[in-house]
């Protein structure tokens, strides 16, 4: 028997320094939590003491904090040649500075390889990308080798920037030949590395002939076995055992997101490769494990361009920036408008002739817009002024809900107006009028949204039994500010960007702003 | 992140005292700030919210048109200036914030004791 | 809006499970929250929205309910977790619940 211990992480998007538990800024250094230093010193403990280690990520390092927002993901490449890592997938998230952003940064500058077998590549960028990522990897482990196949999620052209050269085929389809090809090459022990969610995980496990472990990531599926050691609530145990179409047991693993844990997964294979016995768990790293000095001293003096940056002008904005309470609890905000317009713009993919945009719409809780900006003070727009607006460090988020739940949503936004309460609603891409002489739950009297399957868009009523895209906050997707029916009734749910970094993205592209007040949300009284 | 109260102690009634929370580690400013207490051997009781930016206030019936709450962001500091003071006001104040999408903060308390 | 928690105080064992309800006067959604407070302390939060824990809190403990009717559960008690525990409503002006004191057996 031969003993292969595998390291994992996934969705560590951006989380270079320690964090708060939450994965949010570390404020009690005492009681922070990941950070490339402290998994550098728990990777290299489990180096020193164990023969045979693979050190893997499943995609989505980019997007997530300022660092990706300065660095671009030099910073990926950089700390994780530093931890050096064995191989990595490809997720959604990599393609966000589209695929010049992906290969410039990232796949040059990465000494380990950079899989996906299901992305391929056509027309000029075939030849500009051919061997910066690869289907597989055979690497050499002791005295053995272990095959490595990558896999990325095929909504990527909705949930990011991919340009149109590069085709997402399905997972399963593009895996098993890939995986055949291995087993020629008389590769016996493989493992499936990728970025599609747990459920399609599970699907590669039980459908491709040849997969002897699966390493995922994207939804950011927390598993263990016996009492979790933080808050985060198993979806299952460590590692989840798969029973594939052909009878072999075949173990799933992710290791929840943030860089918050490393995945600790030992597999004992036989001599031809079967799967013996696998066991393990995520291991918390918490601040009973020291951070690295060499790697945390890089990670200073990396930081020192983080602090000029957020001073610096990322636009102007040549009107006040109304996110004062007494509008956006209230009424329509310019501010509302803004931020759900850099939505909108963030998730611009143009992916189908029949469609625009795959999404048109945009909702925002009006308590999470914590602060007005002035354009007296020359119009300029910092980091900063951005962070006292968004001070939450969430993201923004796609969501497919059924127009019944939308409807939901907008009776809740207004259910108890007038007391000044967060839930009130602002939007893009949708019309709204409320009549508050009506009782609550009733109190919406028009709904129009924006089409999308349409080449000049407009606004139609909303229809109860279909199913919408929507961008909306982390925060209302987790049913935050009472939205409970957004939690209990979405049937789809994609992690976006960070919500600063989606809006100083658009004042940078825009260079001057002018948000309006123009009528998306109304009130009427009797008869309409 | 802290919050540290101060201005508690021992005065008679119908006196007056003002409270301090001073705040420090987080945005301040972004926060809707309160107020609550509790009587010695007693539960919980919610005093008073002010918005972040200063625009709203509530108070609890029980101390409405006596006490004032009020803030100075560019000090980082909630104020609640309590007024005709009664025996039954005697308490632990504390400030806290309001639950935000990462949770709550809370100080530690001050207390305060009304008695002739 | 009242909030009526029951029972009072309870008594229990390590390793027990545990439920405290919480009854609101009039519909709140989600708008509750649970905490926890010992002898000379602040309260600490556990549950906010309802059902989502708050950072740092184990996972043994959990919130559930809609509307008028709230529950925290604690799956398996610790030694730790002998104290006093308020619900909060924070639909209309926050309102606590009188507090229910769990004890060791």
């Known amino acids: 028997a031969w003993e292969l211990t595998i390291l994992h992480t996934n969705d560590v998007h951006s989380r270079l320094e320690q964090t708060s538990e939450d994965s949010s800024k570390c404020v009690n250094a005492s009681r922070c939590m990941g950070g490339v230093a402290r998994l550098f010193t728990k990777v290299q403990q489990i180096r020193r003491a164990e023969p045979n280690v693979l050190l893997l990520d499943a995609g989505d390092q980019y997007q997530g904090t300022i660092w990706f927002t300065v660095y671009k993901g030099a910073e990926v490449a950089h700390f994780m040649n530093a931890l050096r890592y064995d191989a990595m997938a490809l997720g959604n998230h990599e393609f966000d500075n589209g695929v010049e952003g992906l290969i410039e940064p990232l796949l040059k500058e990465a000494k380990f390889p950079i899989l996906s077998a299901n992305i391929k590549a056509k027309g000029p960028l075939a030849s500009q990308i051919s061997g910066l990522y690869l289907p597989y990897k055979v690497l050499p482990v002791g005295d053995e080798v272990v095959g490595i196949v990558g896999y990325t999620s095929k909504e990527t052209p909705f949930l990011s920037n991919p340009g149109t050269n590069l085709v997402f085929e399905d997972e399963i389809t593009a895996l098993q030949p890939e995986v055949d090809k291995l087993k020629t090459l008389n590769v016996n022990k493989i493992i499936a590395l990728g970025h599609s969610g747990f459920e399609m995980d599970k699907l590669i496990a039980q459908k491709v002939r040849g997969v002897d472990v699966v390493v995922g990531g994207h939804s950011n599926t927390f598993l263990y076995t016996g009492n979790p050691p933080s808050k985060e609530v198993p979806a299952g145990k460590y590692p989840f055992i798969v029973t594939s179409d052909d009878g072999r047991k075949v173990p799933v693993v992710q290791a929840y997101a943030f860089g918050k844990y490393l995945g600790y997964l030992k597999i004992e294979f036989d001599e031809r490769g079967n799967v013996i016995s696998s066991h393990g768990n995520p291991i918390l790293l918490n601040s009973s494990i020291p951070e690295d000095p060499s790697i945390k001293a890089d990670i200073n003096k990396w930081r020192i361009k983080l602090d000029n940056y957020s001073t610096q002008e990322l636009g102007k904005t040549i009107v006040y920036l109304d996110g004062s309470s007494q509008s956006c609890r209230f009424r329509e905000c310019n501010m509302g408008n803004l931020i759900c317009d850099a939505m909108i713009n963030n998730n611009l993919r143009h992916t189908d002739e029949m469609f625009w945009n795959h999404v048109s719409m945009c909702i925002l809780n009006g308590g999470g817009i914590r602060s007005p900006i002035d354009e007296r003070n020359n119009g300029t727009i910092t980091w900063e002024n951005l962070a006292a607006v968004l001070p939450f460090g969430g993201t923004f988020d796609l969501v497919q809900l059924k127009g019944s739940t939308l409807k939901k949503a907008f009776e809740h936004s207004v259910h108890r107006y007038g007391q000044s309460t967060g839930e009130f609603l602002q939007v893009g891409g949708i019309h709204v009028v409320y009549d508050l002489s009506r009782k609550p739950g009733d109190r919406v009297v028009k709904l129009d949204v924006l089409c999308t399957k349409c080449r000049v868009p407009s606004y139609d009523p909303l229809k109860m039994d279909e199913v919408y895209k929507v961008i909306l906050p982390n925060f209302l997707a987790n049913g935050g500010d009472g939205f409970q029916m957004i939690k209990d009734e979405l049937l789809r749910h994609d992690s976006g960007d960070q919500d600063i970094n989606v809006v100083s993205t658009y004042i940078s592209k825009m260079k001057v702003i002018y948000p309006a007040v123009e009528g998306r949300i109304k009130f009427s009284t009797g008869s309409h | 992140v802290q919050l540290v109260e101060s201005g508690g102690g021992l005065v008679q009634p119908g006196g007056s005292l003002r409270l301090s929370c001073a705040a420090s580690?987080?945005?301040?400013?972004?926060?809707?700030m309160h107020w609550v207490r509790q009587a010695p051997g007693k539960g919980l009781e919610w005093v008073a919210v002010?918005?972040?930016?200063?625009?709203?206030?509530y108070y609890a019936d029980s101390v409405k048109g006596r006490f004032t709450i009020s803030r100075d962001n560019s000090k980082n500091a909630l104020y609640l200036q309590m007024n005709s003071l009664r025996a039954e006001d005697t308490a632990v104040y504390y400030c806290?914030?309001?639950?935000?999408?990462?949770?709550?903060?809370w100080g530690q308390g001050t207390l305060v004791t009304v008695s002739s | 809006i009242q909030m009526t928690q029951s029972p009072s105080s309870l008594s229990a064992s390590v390793g027990d499970r545990v439920t405290i309800t919480c009854r609101a006067s009039?519909?709140?959604?989600?708008?509750l929250a649970w905490y926890q407070q010992k002898p000379g302390k602040a309260p600490k939060l556990l549950i906010y929205?309802?059902?989502t824990l708050q950072s740092g809190v184990p996972s043994r403990f959990s919130g559930s309910g809609s509307g008028t009717d709230f529950t925290l559960t604690i799956s398996s008690l610790q030694p730790e977790d002998f104290a006093t525990y308020y619900c909060?409503?924070?639909?209309?002006?926050?309102?606590f619940g009188q507090g229910t004191r769990l004890e060791i057996k």
């Open positions: 806290a914030t309001e639950i935000a999408a990462k949770g709550d903060y």
């Open positions: 580690g987080f945005t301040f400013s972004s926060y809707d």
């Open positions: 002010m918005s972040y930016e200063g625009s709203n206030k």
């Open positions: 009039q519909g709140i959604s989600n708008y």
């Open positions: 929205a309802a059902s």
């Open positions: 909060q409503q924070s639909y209309s002006t926050p309102h």
